[in-house]
Every structure is written in C-alpha cells, then in structure tokens.
C-alpha cells in the first residue's frame, strides 16, 4: 500500500535569466527511494538521479541544469520558454512510483519572486 505523499514547491515564479530550484520531498513512507526522474511538461527528461549511480543530465539541458540540492534540480539561465509544468517521479521500493508537479512561471519583470514554499499537489 502506498502511504507516502510528495510535497513540492508548488507554483513558483522566477525572473528571466535567473535560476530556480525545483524541489520535491517524499514523506510519510519508509519506502526506499531508488531513483528520481525530473521531466518537463512535454515529457522531455531533464535529469535522472539514481540512489547509487548518481546523476544523469540530459544533453539538451547540460549547460543549464545543475544537480541538487539533494534530489532537487537547479534550472539556470531561465528563458520564457521554461514556463510550464515540471514533474518529479520518485521510484521507490516497495511502494512503487510517486509523482509530484511544479508549475514554473518565468517573468520578464525584475520584481519576480521565487517562492520556496512546499505544498502537496
């Protein structure tokens, strides 16, 4: 039975040219996290983080994506095209798969704030 919940940074905004941390957190389960996949709204893979094998960053993002902090991902040099949904998929044993959603809005405005609050999707 899957008892866990994924908490994410929810809806966040950041300014064009800046960077943002995409973060998910799995709680309320003792399941072992074997792998976390980070994907974009169009199902493009950004990165994979295997518990033992470390990070895999996809070539299309290698210049703009930095691993971490933790199981999260830092997206740099933001463009307006980065606006959209991002998904973290936690592969766990024995529970199975958990998925969290983050919506990122990239703003032209220099007053854009990066909200770091966590929420359950």
């Amino acid at each position: 039975m899957m008892t866990g919940t994924i908490e994410t940074t929810g809806n966040i905004s950041a300014k064009k040219g800046g960077s943002v941390i995409l973060q998910c957190h799995l709680s309320s389960t003792m399941a072992q996290v074997t792998q976390v996949n980070w994907e974009q709204h169009d199902h493009s893979l950004l990165a994979i983080r295997n518990a033992e094998l470390g990070w895999h960053i996809y070539p299309a993002f290698k210049d703009r994506v930095a691993p971490g902090p933790g199981l999260g991902l830092t997206l740099q040099s933001l463009t307006m095209n980065d606006t959209g949904e991002y998904f973290c998929t936690y592969h766990t044993y024995p529970d199975g798969t958990y998925r969290g959603r983050i919506f990122l809005e990239v703003l032209e405005s220099s007053v854009a704030e990066h909200s770091a609050r966590f929420q359950i999707p």
Epitope: L45, E52, G54
Partner: antibody, heavy 119, light 107 residues
Framework: QVQLVQSGAEVKKPGASVKVSCKTS????????MHWVRQAPGKGLEWMGG????????TYNQKFQGRVTLTVDKSSSTAYMELSSLRSEDTVVYYC????????????WGQGTLVTVSS | DIQMTQSPSSLSASVGDRVTITCQAS??????VAWYQQKPGKAPKLLIY???YRYTGVPSRFSGSGSGTDFTFTISSLQPEDIATYYC?????????FGGGTKVEIK
C-alpha cells in the same frame, strides 16, 4: 589516455566462484561509476550492475542479486566483479565499462574476460 | 524489467545502401536510449546517446531518432567498416537492458 584492463580468462567448476578485475588508468577513478556487462558467445549484452567507487554504493540487476558482488580498491583504481554459485550458463564474456560524467552511457570498456564453467 | 525488442536480427545490404534498425521498448523510456556498435571479438563502442546525439568522433552517416517506445538507428550510406552487430540500450530505469542486437553484413 583512459584504459580499462581486465584480468585473464578463467576456467571454473560449477558451484565455484570467480573474481574478475578491471584495472583503470587515465582518469579520476572515484568520479565515474563502473559497471559490468556480460555477453554469452554469439548472444546479446546483459547489464549486471554498477558501483560508485567514491561511496562503494552498488546497484544490481535483480537477476544476479545475491550471486554477484561488486567492489573497488581505490588505492589501485581497480574494480572487481565476483560471481558465486557458478553454473554452465555463466560461461560468458564479462566486460567492465565506465560511464560518461553525469551521463548514463558507457564510453570506455575493458577488453573482456571469458569465464568458462565446466566440470 | 523493460524489454527492448530490436529488429531485424540480421540484415544484408550493399555498400552505399541506407540501413535502418528499429528498437521498441516495452514501456515509455522517453529518450533514454543509446546505440552501440560491436565488432567480432571486441568490446562495444558508443555511437548514439539520448536517442539522437552522436558521440564524439562518430561519423555523420550514423544517426538516431525516436522517443517514448519507438527508436530508429540509421546508417545513411553503409561502408565496409560498418560490418558489426548493433545494440540499443535503455537506461530509463534499472535494470538497464539491451536489445537483442542486429547483425549487419555486406551483400
């Protein structure tokens, strides 16, 4: 230049164990995970597992779980694959292979080690 | 485990021919696919990664495409030195798996 040099061919009896080594040079050994892939004569490739030389953390193909042990010796930049309870179907070529940095692709391979299991 | 079904298992073509190999994953693997070339008695060599990126030093006649479950590997103009067996490989989730291989021969 990067080199992965494996130990020589082995002949083992069923039920025995074999330990194959993979001595590396030309790169920072602890920064790249090392994997083992095997291939039966005239057959396809089969991933056995990988090890993070920095932490010693391992990921195994469940098919081999309990029979295979991956280890490293950081001081000599050598990776090891030990397979126990050998059977005839373990008569294959074993390759070590390193991953690209921050990518799950094998960019360098050892020359292969043939292990023959025969009574 | 994710199965990678490769076809054909073997093919024979003439020098200069366009050769196409397909690989079908049993579930969506996004673009987490590589293609390797293996010559008899040698270790495999990386040709294509992330479905469509050519590895350093790989001739432009080799290309890859696809995402999700269907992937294609193409040799635009077959050369004598391309005689080998080609394998697809997925790393979307462990255990990582390979296709059964396609043996390419010259007519």
């Amino acid at each position: 230049q990067v080199q992965l040099v494996q130990s020589g061919a082995e002949v083992k009896k069923p039920g025995a164990s074999v330990k194959v080594s993979c001595k590396t040079s030309g790169y920072a050994f602890t920064e790249y995970t090392m994997h083992w892939v095997r291939q039966a004569p005239g057959k396809g490739l089969e991933w056995m597992g990988g090890i993070n030389p920095n932490t010693g953390g391992t990921t195994y193909n469940q098919k081999f779980q309990g029979r295979v042990t991956l280890t490293v010796d950081k001081s000599s930049s050598t990776a090891y694959m030990e397979l126990s309870s050998l059977r005839s179907e373990d008569t294959v070529v074993y390759y070590c292979a390193k991953l690209l940095r921050l990518m799950y692709y094998f960019d360098y391979w050892g020359q292969g080690t043939l292990v023959t299991v025969s009574s | 485990d994710i199965q990678m079904t490769q076809s054909p298992s073997s093919l024979s073509a003439s020098v200069g021919d366009r050769v196409t190999i397909t690989c079908q994953a049993s579930q969506d693997v996004r673009t987490a696919v590589a293609w390797y070339q293996q010559k008899p008695g040698k270790a495999p060599k990386l040709l294509i990664y992330s479905a469509s990126y050519r590895y350093t030093g790989v001739p432009s006649r080799f290309s890859g495409s696809g995402s999700g479950t269907d992937f294609t590997f193409t040799i635009s103009s077959l050369q004598p030195e391309d005689i080998a067996t080609y394998y697809c490989h997925q790393h979307y989730i462990t255990p990582w798996t390979f296709g059964g291989g396609t043996k390419v021969e010259i007519k």
